[in-house]
């Protein structure tokens, strides 16, 4: 039995997969900030998690996916206000009793040290210093991401 949050996440991900392939993104669009091979967009208003997920989708992006602790730290360095929380693309899957990224993968327990409970209707937020489990209905800000296409340098044989 999937929760409404899980259904929303799956629906949006499937609709994103159905869309036509777009040409690779070489530079971050206006208002987006580059962090390594990603473009990040930090919201100014607040929303529950599923609305945040939908907003990113309308911008042809997804809620932030964090690969490891190093990427978390670099993202947190962009957050200058200690008091602000941002949704990312991670929520608790009741059916699998585990934290699940919106791309379908599960959280590696070593990646993020989450403060709070792992339970139904819990979603993950980050602040400048920490990672928190919050009720998904909580209205906070969010971070969208777009992947940059890596530019491969052509190697020419010696003439």
């Amino acid at each position: 039995q999937k929760s409404s949050i899980e259904k929303c996440s799956v629906d949006i991900q499937q609709s994103r997969n159905k869309t036509t392939e777009r040409p690779g993104l070489l530079n971050c669009p206006i208002y987006w900030q580059q962090l390594r091979e990603k473009c990040l967009l930090f919201s100014h208003t607040v929303n529950p998690w599923n609305n945040s997920l939908a907003d990113c989708s309308t911008k042809e992006s997804s809620l932030l996916l964090i690969r490891d602790k190093d990427e978390l730290i670099h993202t947190q360095n962009l957050i200058r206000d200690k008091a602000i929380l941002f949704w990312i693309g991670l929520n608790f899957s009741l059916s699998e009793k585990n934290w699940k990224w919106i791309n379908g993968s599960f959280l590696n327990s070593n990646d993020l040290e989450i403060r709070g409970d792992a339970k139904e209707n819990s979603c993950i937020s980050i602040s400048q210093t920490s990672v928190y489990s919050e009720y998904c209905s909580t209205e906070i800000r969010w971070i969208c991401q777009k992947e940059l296409t890596p530019v491969r340098n052509k190697v020419y044989p010696d003439s």
Partner: antibody, heavy 118, light 108 residues
Framework: QVQLQESGPGLVQPSETLSLTCTVS????????WSWIRQPPGKGLEWIGY???????NYNPSLKSRVTLSVDTSKNQFSLKVRSVTAADTAVYYC????????????WGQGTLVTVSS | EIVLTQSPGTLSLSPGERATLSCRAS???????LAWYQQKPGQAPRLLIY???SRATGIPDRFSGSGSGTDFTLTISRLEPEDFAVYYC?????????FGQGTKVEIK
């Protein structure tokens, strides 16, 4: 009630640096994009650039080599500097709050006229 | 950069009439990131419409926006005396954001 107020000299000598500050009240500067737009007398609007509260900037390429934006979150202020000014930089300069791809320039200062003349 | 061309340059109408202002972009405006502003003499511009069709806070419903891609329209259904002003369109979907040259709506 969000309010923005530009301040700075109304007259600048040619080849000097134009410096303006925008003070924000009713909204924390620790969010949003903070923009500068100018309007030469009797003409249209030209976007100069924005600064995000964490220092991330974006400039109009036509002015990029001469413009610097900065932000002071402790004072809730952001600033504009334009180097090597000429008479073509004479304009009303506006500061504005910008919510980026959600809502663009939703709050503006009343504008300040800067004349470049010797 | 995206060039926005507004037409007509001047629109002469009477109060109560319908005003239709056009804004054409030199290339497609990303995600309909197009805004309309109103400017009265000696004042700063005021945001009317964003996202091509969403009214900004406090804007009367006689103002409406439509369009996508390269062609956008601002409609004022019934002109009030306070609506006579200059109107600018702006795209904010690609850098640098650019403005149209403006349409002046004047009393006939």
């Amino acid at each position: 009630q969000v309010q923005l107020q530009e301040s700075g000299p109304g007259l600048v000598q040619p080849s000097e640096t134009l410096s303006l500050t925008c003070t924000v009240s009713g909204s924390s500067i620790s969010s949003y994009y903070w923009s500068w737009i100018r309007q030469p007398p009797g003409k249209g609007l030209e976007w100069i650039g924005y600064i995000y509260y964490n220092g991330n900037t974006n400039y109009n390429p036509s002015l990029k080599s001469r413009v610097t934006l900065s932000v002071d979150t402790s004072k809730n202020q952001f600033s504009l500097k334009v180097r090597s000014v000429t008479a073509a930089d004479t304009a009303v300069y506006y500061c504005a709050r910008d919510s980026g791809p959600w809502v663009p320039l939703d709050y503006w200062g009343q504008g300040t006229l800067v004349t470049v003349s010797s | 950069e995206i060039v926005l061309t507004q037409s007509p340059g001047t629109l002469s109408l009477s109060p109560g009439e319908r005003a239709t202002l056009s804004c054409r972009a030199s290339q497609s405006v990303s995600s309909s990131y197009l805004a309309w502003y109103q400017q009265k003499p000696g004042q700063a511009p005021r945001l009317l419409i964003y996202g091509a069709s969403s009214r900004a806070t406090g804007i009367p419903d006689r103002f409406s926006g439509s369009g996508s891609g390269t062609d956008f329209t601002l409609t004022i259904s019934r002109l009030e005396p306070e609506d006579f002003a200059v109107y600018y369109c702006q795209q904010y979907g690609s850098s640098p954001p650019t403005f149209g040259q403006g349409t002046k709506v004047e009393i006939k």
